[in-house]
């Protein structure tokens, strides 16, 4: 609906009530340290109720946490940015007017991040096909708390051979994360030729370890167009 603000009829007095319990179902919030957390208590009533917040049953004051917190009355929400372990506890919204009071309690657990090697989303990058002269994108979704280094690598041939004297394959780094590289998780290939066909590897490393996944590019002759589905979903299946 275009207009979603409901003004209470001044004669219809009403104690506070929850207007969107769906937003309140998740009572336990386990949040990684440094993330933002938001608790909501959407309510109505007439006169319009006020909202206050308690932490562990006591009035929650701005000075109780470094950086304070934000309350958006129009959203009926409490927002804490960059949570730390000392933010753990029970948070209760108390919504009241002269006709009554209701409350709801959330439990916040702040999870300290344990470093791990990068995790790559399964199925990405995905195999792709395009015609000669076409464009294609490979996407590699990376999950890493520690700063990840992303490389896009392709097997290449040297003097007609795919392998060097040491038996290792010849590899070419096509793109890597760094100052001059925007959105390293995406490798875009434009105006492809048959020589671009082959295996493309997304290799991601951080100080703990590394992970890699690969996809194949098939380059078709101009007259043999690939299916639409593959082209326009850009491998987010």
């Amino acid at each position: 609906m275009a207009e979603d603000f409901v003004s209470e009829n001044s004669n219809n007095k009403r104690a506070p009530y929850w207007t969107n319990t769906e937003k309140m179902e998740k009572r336990l919030h386990a949040v990684p340290a440094a993330n933002t957390v938001k608790f909501r208590c959407p309510a109505g009533g007439n006169p319009m109720p006020t909202m206050r917040w308690l932490k562990n049953g006591k009035e929650f004051k701005q000075e109780h946490r470094i950086g304070g917190y934000k309350v958006r009355n129009q959203h009926w929400s409490l927002i804490m940015e960059s949570v730390v372990p000392s933010d753990k506890g029970n948070y209760t919204c108390v919504v009241e007017n002269e006709y009554g009071s209701i409350n709801h309690t959330y439990h916040l657990d702040v999870v300290e991040r344990s470093p791990h090697r990068p995790i790559l989303q399964a199925g990405l990058p995905a195999n792709a096909s395009t015609v000669v002269g076409g464009d294609v994108e490979f996407v590699c979704k990376v999950y890493s708390d520690a700063q990840p280094h992303i490389q896009w690598i392709k097997h290449v041939e040297k003097n007609g051979s795919k392998y060097g004297p040491d038996g290792l394959p010849y590899l070419k780094v096509l793109k890597h994360s760094g100052i001059n590289s925007s959105n390293a998780e995406v490798l875009a290939l434009f105006n492809v030729t048959e020589a671009d066909a082959g295996e493309y590897i997304c290799k991601v490393s951080n100080y703990i370890g590394q992970a890699n996944q690969s996809a194949w590019l098939t380059v078709l002759p101009k007259q043999q167009a690939p299916g639409r589905e593959k082209e326009h979903h850009h491998h987010h299946h």
Epitope: E3, D4, F5, N35, K70, R72, H75
Partner: antibody
Framework: QVQLLESGGGLVQPGGSLRLSCAAS????????MSWVRQAPGKGLEWVST????????EYADSVKGRFTISRDNSKNTLYLQMNSLRAEDTAVYYC????????????WGQGTLVTVSS | DIQMTQSPSSLSASVGDRVTITCRAS??????LNWYQQKPGKAPKLLIY???NLQSGVPSRFSGSGSGTDFTLTISSLQPEDFATYYC?????????FGQGTKVEIK
């Protein structure tokens, strides 16, 4: 119908000031949070600032904090953005936008006003 | 700040195609995500709010899904008037952020 009309844009030198206005009509202005969003030439959208209907909640993007001030006059149905210490990177089209109630989706936008910071 | 990463940055498609644009948040943002369409020289237009709700007056070929960190905008059958740039926008944090945009061009 809901209408938002920005004004006050123009050419200003680095270090200078400008005050943008957004005249609102077609809805109960004081019931809604309002925001400023900007777009540098050829670039994407960047949120600048938000103010709730009663002015009790105000927030700014880090890039403008301490230089820009958002305010509103509910009796005049007008939103303001006072911009001081302007920089070249503040050059953009500035849009005012209304937030849906109970949400922060910008459901109505003005046509935008261009601010150019250049010597 | 919460970073929003949109992909692809651009795509070429034909009228009638099904188009999918994704947006990923750097942390859980529940369903506090909106999608906008913008045409050159015009103000953005709200398409989807709270991840999956269709804004009044927006054609039903537009749909949104997702929650947490991964979100999708789908155009089921691309129309000529749909060639534009699309942005996602999170409001979970008090510091709102937009994705960098996805330009949908005519093939």
């Amino acid at each position: 119908q809901v209408q938002l009309l920005e004004s006050g844009g123009g050419l200003v030198q680095p270090g200078g000031s400008l005050r943008l206005s957004c005249a609102a009509s077609g809805f109960t202005f004081s019931d809604y949070a309002m925001s400023w969003v900007r777009q540098a030439p050829g670039k994407g959208l960047e949120w600048v600032s938000t103010i709730e209907g009663d002015s009790n909640y105000i927030e700014y993007a880090d890039s403008v904090k301490g230089r820009f001030t958002i305010s509103r006059d509910n009796s005049k149905n007008t939103l303001y953005l006072q911009m001081n210490s302007l920089r070249a990177e503040d050059t953009a089209v500035y849009y005012c936008a209304r937030e849906r109630t109970y949400s922060s989706a910008f459901d109505y936008w003005g046509q935008g006003t261009l601010v150019t910071v250049s010597s | 700040d919460i970073q929003m990463t949109q992909s692809p940055s651009s795509l070429s498609a034909s009228v009638g195609d099904r188009v999918t644009i994704t947006c990923r948040a750097s942390q859980d943002i529940s369903s506090d995500l909106n999608w906008y369409q913008q045409k050159p020289g015009k103000a953005p237009k709200l398409l989807i709010y709270d991840a999956s709700n269709l804004q009044s007056g927006v054609p039903s070929r537009f749909s949104g899904s997702g929650s947490g960190t991964d979100f999708t905008l789908t155009i089921s059958s691309l129309q000529p008037e749909d060639f534009a740039t699309y942005y996602c926008h999170q409001w979970y944090s008090t510091l709102y952020t937009f994705g960098q945009g996805t330009k949908v061009e005519i093939k």
